[in-house]
Interface confidence: low
């Protein structure tokens, strides 16, 4: 009689987390008499998944009745399979022995491999604002995928980006993976409404990628233009100076007005207007009594924005000399020249 | 503009090591993207050999696993092929590359590797 | 690892003519494929990325289409410096894997 033969016909299955698996195994033979048992892993390390003779194993159900005469069926079914049950599992054949039963012959092995889904990619932008022409970097992170093979992909408003790094680890083998990109996204000025766009691919997924976002506006900072002029007025004595900031994001914007080097006027901006690109723009003014000056008057508009370094832009308003001997006769000849940048 | 060029030995005697060096210029391998190497056999037979990451993070052909190491030197903008035990079937047109994300965007000319005694 | 298996393995076209190349992989990869062309003694070129994006600098003639395991490669209208061998690569899982390549020959 040829001896008996444990065919474990799969060399490999692969179930998705959270599905049962069902690993086969037949005998040739009824001889020797002997219990059969799974083992996960071969060698003395190997871990106990069922025995036939006594044990107590929840997960794991017999898919035929073993003590049915005859039966040569000794697959089994694991249920609620996770990424930690991935391995090779054997089909181990014992022959009856005393003390002990002697193990007699073992099946070739079925490797499991488990599916398991990414976790929904979260996309993180820099700790820090920077400005337009400045390189940014983005990143992505996904856990918890099995197997490993994976497709990352950066858009920035719908457009692929290409200048990213990807690295999925483990390197090894794994119960599960991670996997961490970052991209360098050029910023625009435009940038205020854009979005960059993480997105995976696994064999899990069924070709429904996940996606991760990220909002640019958390990461540009368009500084802003000043402008200032002057404003013609009714009354001959006051000089109306506006100060108009424009294109510029964040919202957080500080605005003092200088006379001669001194404050005259500290304001917050409350009230902006939004351009269509999501920067905005606001603006200030200064009645200036110009009969209370008997010299030029050098107007700086100064401003503070998102907590960077003030910008200021100055003007002089000119006296003319027939000004200055008249006091209060002050005429139009008040006229608004620019100087230099303070 | 970015260009690779490889340099080594065009003739390796069999069971040593084969070792290739790629110079990149016109960009920092420091900055970003993967850095390939990639063989040409007789044949029209491409075989993407590994990578290794501007951080320095390597990943091999499982068919290669035992044999290959990737390593760089950041400082000379350079990046390094070993292959160890290499037989006849090893002889090949050696290309370094540079990846853009799963492709490769730029590539060496390549250099002529051969194993024989 | 995937196999992509490309066909017909030669090509002989005459100038003007519009032809295609077929890639198969043996199993889904998306739509993660990319062509490379490969002139006598030169290196391969990038033509298209994930099976229909075209690249800067690739004459427009080229273009491509599929997903899943299924991919072709267009010439519009072969010119003769398109000669040389074409070939499909897996971008989908590691190892990444090339086809076998198509020599294109102009008659």
């Known amino acids: 009689e040829d001896e008996l033969q444990v065919i474990q016909p799969e060399k490999s299955v692969s179930v998705a987390a959270g599905e049962s698996a069902t690993l086969r195994c037949a005998m040739t033979s009824l001889i020797p008499v002997g219990p059969i048992m799974w083992f996960r892993g071969a060698g003395a390390g190997r871990e106990l998944i069922y025995n036939q003779k006594e044990g107590h194993f929840p997960r794991v159900t017999t898919v035929s009745e073993l003590t049915k005469r005859n039966n040569l069926d000794f697959s089994i079914s694991i249920s609620n399979i996770t990424p930690a049950d991935a391995g090779t599992y054997y089909c181990v054949k014992f022959r009856k022995g005393s003390p002990d039963d002697v193990e007699f012959k073992s099946g070739a092995g079925t490797e499991l491999s488990v599916r398991a889904k990414p976790s929904a990619p979260v996309v993180s932008g820099p700790a820090v604002r920077a400005t337009p022409e400045h390189t940014v970097s983005f990143t992505c992170e996904s856990h918890g995928f099995s197997p490993r093979d994976i497709t990352l992909k950066w858009f920035k408003n719908g457009n692929e980006l290409s200048d990213f790094q990807t690295n999925v680890d483990p390197a090894g083998d794994s119960v599960s993976y991670s996997i961490h990109s970052t991209a360098r996204v050029v910023l625009t000025r435009g940038d205020v409404h854009s979005q960059v766009i993480c997105e995976i691919a696994h064999i899990t997924l069924q070709g429904d990628p996940l996606r991760g976002t990220a909002n640019l506006s958390e990461a540009i900072r368009v500084p802003p233009t000043l402008e200032v002029t002057q404003q013609p007025m009714r009354a001959e004595n006051q000089a109306n100076v506006t100060c108009q900031v424009s294109n510029f994001y964040p919202r957080g914007l500080q605005l003092t007005w200088l006379e001669n080097g001194n404050v005259s006027r500290t304001e917050t901006a409350s009230t902006l207007i939004e351009n269509k690109d999501g920067t905005y723009n606001w603006m200030s003014w200064l009645l200036v009594n110009t009969c209370a000056h008997r010299d030029d008057v050098v107007l700086t508009c100064q401003v503070e924005h998102d907590g960077q370094q003030a910008v200021s832009k100055s003007y002089a308003l000119e006296i003319s000399a027939h000004q200055k001997e008249h006091g209060s006769d002050i005429t139009h000849e008040a006229a608004l020249a620019p100087t230099a940048p303070l | 503009d970015v260009q690779l060029q490889e340099s080594g030995p065009g003739l390796v005697k069999p069971s040593q090591s084969l070792s290739l060096t790629c110079t990149v210029t016109?960009?920092?391998?420091?900055?970003?993207?993967?850095w390939h190497w990639i063989r040409h056999f007789p044949g029209n037979i491409l075989e993407w050999m590994g990578y290794?990451?501007?951080?320095?993070?390597?990943n091999y052909n499982p068919s290669l696993k035992s044999r290959i190491s990737i390593t760089h030197d950041t400082s000379k903008n350079h990046f390094f092929l070993r292959l160890n035990s290499v037989t006849a079937e090893d002889t090949a047109t050696y290309y370094c590359a540079r990846g853009g994300g799963a492709w490769f965007t730029y590539w060496g000319q390549g250099t002529l590797v051969t194993v024989s005694a | 690892d995937i196999v992509m298996t490309q066909s017909p393995a030669t090509l002989s076209v005459t100038p003007g003519d519009r032809v295609s190349l077929s890639c198969r992989a043996s199993?889904?990869?998306?739509?993660?494929l990319h062509w490379y062309h490969q002139k006598s003694h030169e290196s391969p070129r990038l033509l298209i990325k994930?099976?229909?994006q075209s690249i800067s600098g690739i004459p427009s003639r080229f273009s491509a289409g599929g997903s899943g395991s299924d991919f072709t490669l267009t010439i519009n209208s072969v010119e003769p410096e398109d000669v040389g061998v074409y070939y499909c690569?897996?971008?989908?899982?590691?190892?990444?894997?090339f086809g076998g390549g198509t020599k294109l020959e102009i008659k």
């Open positions: 199993q889904s990869i998306s739509d993660s």
């Open positions: 994930y099976a229909s």
């Open positions: 290794i990451t501007y951080s320095g993070i390597s």
């Open positions: 016109g960009f920092s391998i420091s900055r970003g993207y993967d």
């Open positions: 690569q897996n971008g989908h899982s590691l190892p990444w894997t």
